[in-house]
Interface confidence: medium
């Protein structure tokens, strides 16, 4: 069996997870990609979806959670803005092939969230600018129920990541603390 | 393997606003993030931001925030920084560098890589 | 914003030297950590990221270590070309920040 590896993020509350989930760009371009939770020897659970078929980097909005897929590039965004110290745990990207179990996009992530200052949005170290709003969209009813029984893990740190949907806009001007961590080619 | 090319060296007054260009060249622009680094004489290096094209974002230290522009033109290759209001401490060596961050395969990182770097465009503000 | 400190400032060292710079972070950076080398009037080239993974084209007697908020660059055999000043940069969270610097010179 292929050996399940991680990737490790340490950040603090109040920042923001922005990872991407690359992809084979002529399989998968269109098909629709989720975001998962996976949690203590459970089946992952699906915290968020792009659109079935999937739309060139158009944002959907799942509560604190932003996913974006640019064909042209082969590449799925995610970003969790406003993490809390509940959003620790283990996370995946997926792909959704039905009627085949999804396929997931290695390695796995390990996202620590730690107690921490980070101030309001705009008062800390750094800024994002963005030229579009994300419009507040809710996209659950679109996600697949199904999971693949082979993405259970052996014991992961509980976290208890589930999301809501905020009744305002984020504006992505706002979000700070962005982590960018680097892909080497 | 990608390719910088700095716009060159500028002499501007106080007050004033620089803009440095960088042009990229042996790649795909848009499968590139691209970042501004100075340095002041005698000093060591300090980021000021980055942009990451496809995204349509950029990000700013903190320090540079109001005064610091980083736009990216996919047309002609080529990032730009510009700094506004300009005083003395502003003298520095401007260095733009990039790495490539899509089609990794395995890694979900990206980020504002410094892997190229281009040659330096000395920037003097001087009344 | 996360402080990085470089030791030592600066180092004399040989040809054919094994030489060892540290570098600290004032929180845990996982392994989220590049090497830099500058020589005079030229740009910085990269030359570790990710702590340990060195960049192509860098020679192998270069090579680094460490997690968390402790990581070192050694040079197991130094060249007369290795002569310069070395940087880490920290790239876990904004602003990203350099250490301030180490400069190697001949002895």
């Known amino acids: 069996a292929t050996k399940l590896t991680e990737e490790k993020y340490e950040l603090k509350e109040g920042q923001t997870l922005d990872v991407k989930c690359d992809y084979t760009l002529e399989k998968f371009a269109s098909s629709q990609k989720a975001w998962q939770i996976i949690r203590d020897g459970e089946m992952p659970k699906t915290l968020a979806c792009t659109e079935r078929p999937s739309k060139n980097s158009h944002p959907v909005q799942v509560g604190r959670i932003i996913l974006e897929d640019y064909h042209d590039h082969g590449l799925l965004r995610v970003r969790m803005v406003n993490l809390q110290v509940e959003d620790s745990g283990l996370y995946q990207c997926v792909i959704y092939q039905p009627p085949k179990e999804p396929h997931m996009l290695f390695d796995r992530i390990r996202l620590v969230v730690t107690k921490g200052f980070s101030g309001t949005p705009g008062s800390n170290e750094n800024s994002t600018q963005n030229v579009y709003k994300i419009p507040p969209t809710t996209t659950k009813a679109l996600c697949p129920l199904y999971t693949s029984p082979r993405t259970v893990t052996q014991a992961p740190p509980k976290s208890t990541a589930d999301v809501s949907t905020p009744d305002s806009e984020i504006n992505l001007t706002n979000v700070t603390d962005i982590i960018r961590v680097p892909v080497f080619n | 393997q990608v390719q910088l090319v700095q716009s060159g060296a500028e002499v501007k007054k106080p007050g004033s606003s620089v803009k440095v260009s960088c042009k990229s060249s042996?790649?795909?622009?848009?499968?590139?993030?691209f970042t501004w680094v100075r340095q002041a004489p005698g000093q060591g290096l300090e980021w000021m931001g980055g942009?990451?094209?496809?995204?349509?974002?950029?990000n700013y230290a903190q320090k540079f925030q109001g005064r610091v522009t980083i736009t990216a033109d996919e047309s002609t290759s080529t990032a730009y920084m510009e700094l506004s209001s300009l005083r003395s401490e502003d003298t520095a060596v401007y260095y733009c560098?990039?790495?490539?961050?899509?089609?990794?395969?395995?890694?979900?990182?990206?980020?504002?890589?410094?892997?190229?770097w281009g040659q330096g465009t000395t920037v003097t503000v001087s009344s | 914003d996360i402080q990085m400190t470089q030791s030592p400032t600066s180092l004399s060292a040989s040809v054919g030297d094994r030489v060892t710079i540290t570098c600290r972070a004032s929180?845990?950076?996982?392994?989220?950590l590049a090497w830099y080398q500058q020589k005079p009037e030229k740009a910085p080239k990269s030359l570790i990221y990710a702590a340990s993974s060195l960049q192509s084209g860098v020679p192998s007697r270069f090579s680094g270590s460490g997690s968390g908020t402790d990581f070192t660059l050694t040079i197991s055999s130094l060249q007369p070309e290795d002569f310069a000043t070395y940087y880490c940069q920290q790239y876990n969270s904004y602003p990203y920040t350099f250490g301030q610097g180490t400069k190697l010179e001949i002895k």
């Open positions: 560098a990039s790495s490539h961050f899509s089609g990794s395969g395995s890694s979900h990182y990206y980020y504002y890589g410094m892997h190229v």
């Open positions: 929180q845990g950076i996982s392994s989220w």
């Open positions: 942009i990451i094209p496809i995204f349509r974002t950029a």
């Open positions: 042996g790649g795909t622009f848009s499968s590139y993030a």
